[in-house]
């Protein structure tokens, strides 16, 4: 079957790295410079990626295999193959349209990315807050109470701010 | 492909409670806040509260304190809301959606079908 | 408590007309949070139309547009040219703090 459709189609003896080129008789030439062809076979070869502005190159581009781009230092990836660059925040803080803002009463973030998220129920395993959370850290879940030996007790969470819609553990 | 179906349309009678099923698929169910919001006939959309399924940390909207409650079972990437004390006023198609976390005032990508619950005496 | 104001509440329109809802917020600041919007037809779960204030999702025709204005702390959303498929209701979305959503009440878009 190869051999057949190499008959009919020259183009497909074109490696990567090449195009199969029609002003040339179908004759394979080269991709030109910050072009690629990653497949063989190939009518056209692709422009490179090119990494600008937030981005910055992690892989050059070659004649068979786009640039790579990662982003610059304050920023992180987001989307397949890096599409996009989003700020950093730093722990506790969510990144919103206003920039970085602080994680709200009951959520926190561990992270430089991402969203702050809920500090863990306890109750819901039957167990007791053993450290508060932060902004920056969950709660740690000890013991229910009723597994703590007497004279021992645990800490109890501060009472939830009025921050809208959050439910105390 | 991510998926929510939610559970099918139920009637209730006053002072019952109903609760209503999300099964999400297509995505780390563990890793995104799961929001429920309602609408009654006509009306707008009414934000109930959300979950986070990773560590089952709620947050409820203050109308529904008390009322609402969310769980998530990880083993079946299955949301639930429950909503107790039920009244002719809770009579509404209640959603389940998802919020990317790109941001924190993020959209609602990807919504349940809805599920109708009528509260009739 | 943060409160977003539509207006219209409803409107008829003509196919080919340009058609555009604004989304008002009542206390503090549009540029402190996104504004997204949400197509909702008869039946049918919300379809996002406009996400953080101006970018379409893949599949949404480009003649749905959406802007902000400061000085008026509004947001707006604008179908260039109606269509027989855009009739529908449009809802708006913000914040109130990143864990509490507000929508708008809606926008009824109606054939003339």
């Known amino acids: 079957f190869e051999r057949t459709r190499s008959l009919q189609d020259p183009c497909s003896n074109c490696p990567a790295g090449t195009f199969c080129d029609n002003n040339r008789n179908q004759i394979c030439s080269p991709c030109p410079p910050n072009s690629f062809s990653s497949a063989g076979g190939q009518r056209t070869c692709d422009i490179c990626r090119q990494c600008k502005g937030v981005f910055r190159t992690r892989k050059e581009c070659s004649s068979t295999s786009n640039a790579e781009c990662d982003c610059t230092p304050g920023f992180h990836c987001l989307g397949a193959g890096c599409s996009m660059c989003e700020q950093d925040c730093k722990q506790g803080q969510e990144l919103t349209k206003k920039g970085c803002k602080d994680c709200c009463f009951g959520t926190f973030n561990d992270q430089k990315r991402g969203i702050c998220r809920p500090w863990t129920n306890c109750s819901l395993d039957g167990k007791s807050v053993l450290v508060n959370g932060t902004k920056e850290r969950d709660v740690v879940c000890g013991p229910s109470p009723a597994d703590l030996s007497p004279g021992a007790s645990s800490v109890t969470p501060p009472a939830p701010a009025r921050e809208p819609g959050h439910s105390p553990q | 492909e991510v998926q929510l179906v939610q559970s099918g349309a139920e009637v209730k009678k006053p002072g019952s409670s109903v609760k209503v099923s999300c099964k999400a698929s297509?995505?780390?169910?563990?890793?995104?806040?799961i929001y429920w919001v309602r609408q009654a006939p006509g009306q707008g959309l009414e934000w109930i509260g959300n979950?986070?399924?990773?560590?089952?940390?709620?947050f409820y909207g203050e109308k529904f304190m008390g009322r609402a409650t969310f769980t998530a079972d990880t083993s079946t990437s299955t949301a639930y809301m429950e909503l107790s004390s039920l009244r002719s006023e809770d009579t509404a198609v209640y959603y389940c959606a998802r919020r990317p976390d790109y941001s924190g005032d993020d959209y609602f990508d990807y919504w349940g079908q809805g599920t109708l619950v009528t509260v009739s005496s | 408590d943060v409160q977003l104001t539509q207006s219209p509440s409803s409107l008829s329109a003509s196919v080919g007309d340009r058609v555009t809802i604004t989304c008002k917020l009542n206390?503090?600041?549009?540029?402190?949070?996104?504004v997204h919007w949400y197509q909702q037809k008869p039946g049918k779960a919300p379809k996002t139309m406009i996400y953080?204030?101006?970018?379409?999702p893949d599949g949404v025709p480009s003649r749905f547009s959406g802007s902000g204005d400061s000085s008026s702390n509004s947001a707006f959303l604008t179908i260039s040219s109606l269509q027989p498929e855009d009739f529908a209701t449009y809802y708006c979305?913000?914040?109130?703090?990143?864990?509490?959503?507000?929508f708008g009440q809606g926008t009824k878009v109606e054939i003339k």
């Open positions: 206390s503090g600041n549009i540029g402190s949070y996104y």
């Open positions: 953080r204030d101006d970018k379409r």
């Open positions: 979305h913000s914040y109130d703090s990143t864990i509490t959503p507000v």
């Open positions: 297509g995505y780390t169910f563990t890793s995104y806040y």
């Open positions: 979950i986070w399924p990773g560590n089952g940390g709620t």
